[in-house]
Interface confidence: low
Amino acid sequence: AITEAREEAKPYPLFPGPLPGSLQTDHTSLLSLPHTSGYQPALMFSPTQPGRPYTGNVAIPRVTSAGSKLLPPLAFKHTVGHIILSEHKDVKFNCSISVPNIYQDTTISWWKDGKELLGAHHAITQFYPDDEVTAIIASFSITSVQRSDNGSYICKMKINNEEIVSDPIYIEVQGLPHFTKQPESMNVTRNTAFNLTCQAVGPPEPVNIFWVQNSSRVNEQPEKSPSVLTVPGLTEMAVFSCEAHNDKGLTVSKGVQINIKAIPSPPTEVSIHNSTAHSILISWVPGFDGYSPFRNCSVQVKEVDPLSNGSVMIFNTSASPHMYQIKQLQALANYSIGVSCMNEIGWSAVSPWILASTTEGAPSVAPLNVTVFLNESRDNVDIRWMKPLTKRQAGELVGYRISHVWQSAGISKELLEEVGQNNSRAQISVQVHNATCTVRIAAVTKGGVGPFSDPVKIFIPAHGWVDHAPSSTPAPGNADPVLII
C-alpha cells in the first residue's frame, strides 16, 4: 500500500527509522543487513504494484577479491509515496540506502518526471559511515511550493556501472482553482442565444463551476469544469462571471460585459470643408456604434428653396473615412445636409442638419451673334457680340474673354484679351498681315469661364487691300462660319 503523507505545517522527515542525529546511538534499525555467507537475493515486490516481481532498484553485488562471500542486494529503503500539500508551503523529502564500504565514490542524483534535477535545487546528501556499511541519506527540499513542482521524484545511484533507482515520491501541490479559460466579452443581438465558456483546474479535483449574472447565481446546481453556459437571449446589457470551487476554496473569473447590439447613435459635428459650384465636401464624427461595426453611411441633401419640390437626394458611402464629396449639385444654391450611419441592426437617426451653399457656377452659354470685321485704316479688327442669357446660378457677369488665333504660313499664335461686363464690342490690333484671324468669345463670372462661342474667321490681307465686310457667327444649325472678303 502507498504511504500517504497529508499536509502539515512543518517540513517532512521522510526517511524511515531514527533521524540522522540519533544514528550514533542506535544503528540497528537503519543499518541492519544480513551478512550470512549463504545469503541469496530474494525477489522484492513493488509497493505500487503488489504481487509483481520488482528488481528495478536492486543491484546484485559481484564476487570480490576479499573472498567469495555474496553481499546482500543494494536497494533504497521504502519511504513515503505521496505528499499532498498546499501552494506556498515548504516540503522536504528524502531517500536512504545502506552501502557496503567496499564500494567507493557513490553519488546520488535526483530526478523529476524523467529529467535530472540540476543546478539550483536544494539537494543535500549526508554520509553516516560504520565499520562495514555507510548509511547515505539524500534530502530534497522545496520552499514555497508551486503547482509546477507537482510530479514524481526519484533518487538514482550508480555503483559498479549498475543503476539503483528508488521508489517514486509523488508530490501533489493543491490550491485554489486555476482558470484555463474564462468567459469573453461579447456584443450580441437582442433575444438571441449565445454561449459562454469557463474552465478551471485543480488539484484538487474536481472543480465545480457556478455561473453569475449581474451578481446573482444562474445555476444553483454546480457543473463540473469545463462548463458552457447557454444564455437564451438578453434584452439588456449584463455582466457575467463564473465561480470555480474545489476543496481548497473558490476563485472568481473576471466579469465580462455582454452588450446588446443596437442601432448607432447619430453622427455628430457635421462639418463643411469646401464647396464649389457643383459639389460640397463634408466630414462628420461617427456616433456610438451600438456595439456593432458601422457598415455604411447615408448623406441626405435637401435644397433649401421655396420653389424646390422638397425632395431629398440620398448618397450612400462607406462608413470610413468619415468624409464625403456631394456632387451633381446646382450652383449658387442652398442645401440642408444630414448624415445617418448603419450597422447590422439598422440606421441611426439623422445627425443635426447643417446649412451649406454652393458657389457661383461658370456661365453655361456663350455670347451670341459674334461678328468680326477688319478696319484697315486703323489696322485693327472690330469684334461685336450680344450678352448671353445666363441663369441666376451662374452668378454675376464680370466680363468676357476673347481668344484670337493668328495663322499664317504654318505659324499659329493665340492671344487672350479680357474686357469688362459692360462691353459688347472690342477692338484688337492686327498682329499679322496676309493671315487668318479666328475669334472666339466666352462670358466670365466669379464662378469661372463659360463655353467659348463658335469660331469666326476673317482673312487679313496684305497692306493695300480693302475689306469692310464682316464675318459673323452663323445662325443656329448652319454650317461653318462663312468668311467674307
Epitope: E269, S271, I272, S283, V285
Partner: antibody, heavy 118, light 107 residues
Framework: QVQLQQPGAELVVPGASVRLSCKAS????????MHWVKQRPGQGLEWIGE????????NYNQKFKDKSTLSLDKSSSTAYMQLSSLTSEDSAVYYC???????????WGQGTTLTVSS | QVVLTQSPAIMSASPGEKVTITCSAS?????MLWFQQKPGTSPKLWIY???NLASGVPARFSGSGSGTSYSLTISRLEAEDAATYYC??????????FGAGTKLELK
C-alpha cells in the same frame, strides 16, 4: 481602466526601419480608432495617421504617407507603426492615442522616444 | 489643410491672473479641441467641442469661439496650470492638425 502601453525608447541607425508598438487594455480594442502623433524635442504635435481596428482601414497625413505604415494585431490588442528609411529628422517621441466615438483623443500612451543615430 | 496659429507662443502670468490663449484657423472650422501637456508627459484632452471641459479639468478653464477664431481662458491662474496648451481641429481632415502650442509659465 484604459491603458495604452508603449516601449520607452528605441535606438536605430540611419536608413533602417523600426516598428513601434502600442498595446491597448481596459476596453474593447476593435471599437475605437487608434491615432499616432509625432513630437520632436521641444516642438509641437504632428498627426501621422489613424487606423480602425475593426477592419484595418487607415488614413494618413500626406506628409507621412511614404514614411509610416499602420497595422494591428487584434488578438493581442496591439497597434503598430512601421517607420522606414529613418533619418535624424525622424528622431522624436511617438505617441499612440485612442480616439473615442466623438473624435476626441481621450487616452494617450506614454510615448516611445525614437533616436536615429549612427 | 487647415493651419492653426496659436498666440502667444510663450506667456508668463501670475497666480490669480486671468489668462487667454487664442487659436486662429486658416479657414473656418466647426469646433476646436485643446490639450494640456506638461514636460515629460503625454498630452491630455482638456477641452472638446470648443467649450466642453474634459473629465477632471477644473472649472476655472473655459473655451469659446467659432469660425476661424477660438480661445482658451483660465479665469484665475493657479501654479498647476503651468504647461503647454495645444489647439486641435478635425473639421477639415485628413489631416488632423494641431497648433504650434502656447507655453504658459508662472511669474
Amino acid at each position: 481602466q484604459v491603458q495604452l502601453q508603449q516601449p520607452g525608447a528605441e535606438l536605430v541607425v540611419p536608413g533602417a526601419s523600426v516598428r513601434l508598438s502600442c498595446k491597448a487594455s481596459g476596453y474593447t480594442f476593435i471599437n475605437y480608432w487608434m491615432h499616432w502623433v509625432k513630437q520632436r524635442p521641444g516642438q509641437g504635435l504632428e498627426w501621422i495617421g489613424e487606423i480602425d481596428p475593426s477592419d484595418s482601414y487607415a488614413n494618413y497625413n500626406q506628409k507621412f504617407k511614404d514614411k509610416s505604415t499602420l497595422s494591428l494585431d487584434k488578438s493581442s490588442s496591439t497597434a503598430y507603426m512601421q517607420l522606414s528609411s529613418l533619418t535624424s529628422e525622424d528622431s522624436a517621441v511617438y505617441y499612440c492615442a485612442r480616439c473615442d466615438y466623438y473624435g476626441r483623443l481621450d487616452y494617450w500612451g506614454q510615448g516611445t522616444t525614437l533616436t536615429v543615430s549612427s | 489643410q487647415v493651419v492653426l496659429t496659436q498666440s502667444p507662443a510663450i506667456m508668463s502670468a501670475s497666480p490669480g491672473e486671468k489668462v487667454t490663449i487664442t487659436c486662429s484657423a486658416s479657414s473656418s472650422v466647426s469646433y476646436m479641441l485643446w490639450f494640456q501637456q506638461k514636460p515629460g508627459t503625454s498630452p491630455k484632452l482638456w477641452i472638446y467641442s470648443t467649450s466642453n471641459l474634459a473629465s477632471g479639468v477644473p472649472a476655472r478653464f473655459s473655451g469659446s469661439g467659432s469660425g476661424t477664431s477660438y480661445s482658451l481662458t483660465i479665469s484665475r491662474l493657479e501654479a498647476e496650470d503651468a504647461a503647454t496648451y495645444y489647439c486641435q481641429q478635425r473639421s477639415s481632415y485628413p489631416p488632423i492638425t494641431f497648433g504650434a502650442g502656447t507655453k504658459l509659465e508662472l511669474k
